[in-house]
């Protein structure tokens, strides 16, 4: 058993049918010695008396808010949560496996640049009685500071019969140098509590591996005289690290017909312009990627050919 | 990328081309190592990230773009001097650029070159003959060093009398390649920045 926060405790259980569970001793936080009784949640049934209460915690029915009283007055509370260990592996019931970029990916994180700021998000089908708490650091043995905000509900979607909820959090490394070469990964730890169930999820990454630039901005077309060709131009996104000559991007320019089946013409360039043939009803799209370290491509920025 | 790519101008800052080749070569070598050594811990998540140049060179600090010198977090151990040197800078206005930066890059390359050659000698003794260093990568390191044209003492190739532990050598190869790729990215960024200046 360990303390998650004041008066909230996590009991770790080897979870299998007929498991013996864990013996837990609760102590009433009071100078009083006599006439103390214990109850669980809203029930008025007295579970025991005395300054301490010994319970055998086996199932969720044994978890909850234990309260000690004296003469009708509440003295203190202890909330017991359960953390299930199923065949040596901690349960992952609360969050959905996003399966990207690989199986067992519960937390996904992205950074728009090298400033040390990043966003993580996760999915769940649970709509109520759900709380999250996020901590982060650079490295784990001698951790350096990363400050995270509060997790917030950022999107709701309908997936088949289920509703899916997306939560996200923004974090900022306290003293980040954009040009630094990372040798210790960022660690992100999310505590999730649903009703009386506790779970924790972790992700470990280098900022360089989660970079995804914003799409190029100011995408414009300039027709070339007496030609079906157009000059496409764009700019680096505002959120990208500067100077751009040091943090360079490379670009992919794509001409896509109206139908998805039509052949796509693609050109790669390090410049912020390109000359392409603009077909009728086609659209031109441009996306960006770090020129030197191949992390994710940005989303496409698009303009119609007409 | 096997699709059309815009080619750089021929009159470019001479080292940029070499540094781009370097990054391509080390990236290819790392990919090859990860595929060949699939049963070894060779992914970024599995290895310890060690920098053999730590406390010996200060490339990141010495080559920091001027715009980032205002960032407190980037100035931990910065001791830059604005002097010009090295043939890469020959035909440019480089009054603001640091000789320290280019000599630091040169020292990095020299250190990695020695490590890689020592390692290759060990790998050649492996009866499994599983993996060797790409000669192209070693050649590209050499070319960039020549382009940088800094003279410094020759570092003798390390020789080891004990029987090599091939498992450890292959894991060390992965660690070295990961670290060298990160340094090659920094070198490429620096060269690109110098080219634009």
């Amino acid at each position: 058993i360990w303390e998650l926060k004041k008066d909230v405790y996590v009991v770790e259980l080897d979870w299998y049918p007929d498991a013996p569970g864990e013996m837990v001793v609760l102590t009433c936080d009071t100078p009083e010695e006599d006439g103390i009784t214990w109850t669980l949640d809203q029930s008025s049934e007295v579970l025991g008396s005395g300054k301490t209460l010994t319970i055998q915690v086996k199932e969720f029915g044994d978890a909850g808010q234990y309260t000690c009283h004296k003469g009708g007055e509440v003295l203190s509370h202890s909330l017991l949560l359960l953390h299930k260990k199923e065949d040596g592996i901690w349960s992952t019931d609360i969050l959905k496996d996003q399966k990207e970029p690989k199986n067992k990916t519960f937390l996904r994180c992205e950074a728009k640049n090298y400033s040390g700021r990043f966003t993580c998000w996760w999915l769940t089908t649970i709509s109520t009685d759900l709380t999250f708490s996020v901590k982060s650091s650079r490295g784990s043995s001698d951790p350096q500071g990363v400050t995270c905000g509060a997790a917030t509900l950022s999107a709701e979607r309908v997936r088949g019969d289920n509703k899916e909820y997306e939560y996200s959090v923004e974090c900022q490394e306290d003293s980040a140098c954009p040009a630094a070469e990372e040798s210790l990964p960022i660690e992100v730890m999310v505590d999730a509590v649903h009703k009386l169930k506790y779970e924790n999820y972790t992700s470990s990454f280098f900022i360089r591996d989660i970079i995804k630039p914003d799409p190029p901005k100011n995408l414009q077309l300039k027709p070339l005289k007496n030609s079906r060709q157009v000059e496409v131009s764009w700019e680096y996104p505002d959120t990208w690290s500067t100077p751009h000559s040091y943090f360079s991007l490379t670009f992919c320019v794509q001409v896509q017909g109206k139908s998805k089946r039509e052949k796509k013409d693609r050109v790669f360039t390090d410049k912020t312009s390109a000359t392409v043939i603009c077909r009728k009803n086609a659209s031109i799209s441009v996306r960006a990627q770090d020129r030197y370290y191949s992390s994710s491509w940005s989303e496409w920025a698009s303009v119609p050919c007409s | 990328r096997n699709l059309p790519v815009a080619t750089p101008d021929p009159g470019m800052f001479p080292c940029l081309h070499h540094s781009q080749n370097l990054l391509r070569a080390v990236s290819n070598m790392l990919q090859k190592a990860r595929q060949t050594l699939e049963f070894y811990p060779c992914t970024s998540e599995e290895i310890d990230h060690e920098d053999i140049t730590k406390d010996k060179t200060s490339t990141v600090e010495a080559c920091l773009p001027l715009e980032l010198t205002k960032n407190e977090s980037c100035l931990n151990s910065r001791e830059t001097s604005f002097i010009t040197n090295g043939s890469c800078l020959a035909s440019r206005k480089t009054s603001f650029m640091m000789a320290l930066c280019l000599s630091s890059i040169y020292e990095d390359l020299k250190m990695y070159q020695v490590e890689f050659k020592t390692m290759n000698a060990k790998l050649l003794m492996d009866p499994k003959r599983q993996i060797f260093l790409d000669q192209n990568m070693l050649a590209v390191i050499d070319e960039l060093m020549q382009a940088l044209n800094f003279n410094s003492e020759t570092v003798p190739q390390k020789s080891s009398l004990e029987e090599p532990d091939f498992y450890k050598t292959k894991i060390k190869l992965c660690i070295l390649l990961h670290a060298f790729r990160i340094r090659a990215v920094t070198i490429d960024r620096v060269m690109s920045y110098l080219n634009a200046s």
């Epitope: 049918p17 498991a19 019931d93 | -």
Partner: antibody
Framework: QVQLVQSGGGVVQPGRSLRLSCAAS????????MHWVRQAPGKGLEWVAF????????YYADSVKGRFTISRDNSKNTLYLQMKSLRAEDTAVYYC????????WGQGTMVTVSS | SYVLTQPPSVSGTPGQRVTISCSGG????????VKWYQQLPGTAPKLLIY???QRPSGVPDRFSGSKSGTSASLAITGVQAEDEADYYC????????????FGTGTKVTVLG
């Protein structure tokens, strides 16, 4: 006393369907994940499928994906395996088992796919 | 499609020490705990070892398990005639959990 009692096995022709049941007692069935495991005659153990305690997630071996469906009725304390488009290579003893460090197995039920 | 490899058979005379190996990889045994099962002819498997080296109550202490790196082993110290059975190791792969990964199985024969 944890008990898993299986039923539903038998002889079936290739291409036909069969449903296996596993009735649980002696524990809170709705709190635990459950597996199906099979063993072809003279062969080793092969995992078939898993279902979460609340039925929210199901996982299948590639060899049965799209043909077999694992399900549970927590109000009846019963686990099911619906097998469709059966093949000769599905012939095996099928076991249900609880998920956890200490597990309990059903007695097994024989499924024979033969024309 | 078995990823955990066991020797097909091992044998020993009563009282001898018999060991069965189970060889896997970094993503299974290297990352997860190992279990061992005993299966007597015509019966369901019975758990012998969980968590690499833990014995459930009721399992004789002549059975012991261990794990090192990407391999595990089961030892029967002082093998007895009633130990003649098939033995299976089991683990998980970190990418496909909760799918059970079973070993190929080992037939233990007690001679004489």
């Amino acid at each position: 006393q944890v008990q898993l009692v299986q039923s539903g096995g038998g002889v079936v022709q290739p291409g036909r369907s069969l449903r296996l049941s596993c009735a649980a007692s002696g524990f809170t069935f709705s709190s635990y994940g459950m597996h199906w495991v099979r063993q072809a005659p003279g062969k080793g153990l092969e995992w078939v499928a898993f279902i979460r305690y609340d039925g929210s997630n199901k996982y299948y071996a590639d060899s049965v994906k799209g043909r077999f469906t694992i399900s549970r009725d927590n109000s009846k304390n019963t686990l099911y395996l619906q097998m469709k488009s059966l093949r000769a290579e599905d012939t095996a003893v099928y076991y249900c088992k609880t998920h956890g460090s200490h597990d309990n197995w059903g007695q097994g039920t024989m499924v024979t796919v033969s024309s | 499609s078995y990823v955990l490899t066991q020797p097909p058979s091992v044998s020993g005379t009563p009282g001898q020490r018999v060991t069965i190996s189970c060889s896997g990889g970094r993503s299974n045994i290297g990352s997860n705990a190992v279990k061992w099962y005993q299966q007597l002819p015509g019966t369901a498997p019975k758990l012998l070892i969980y968590g690499n080296d833990q014995r459930p109550s009721g399992v004789p202490d002549r059975f012991s398990g261990s794990k090192s790196g990407t391999s595990a082993s089961l030892a029967i110290t002082g093998v007895q005639a009633e130990d003649e059975a098939d033995y299976y190791c089991q683990s998980y792969d970190r990418g496909t959990h909760p799918a059970l990964l079973f070993g190929t199985g080992t037939k233990v024969t007690v001679l004489g």
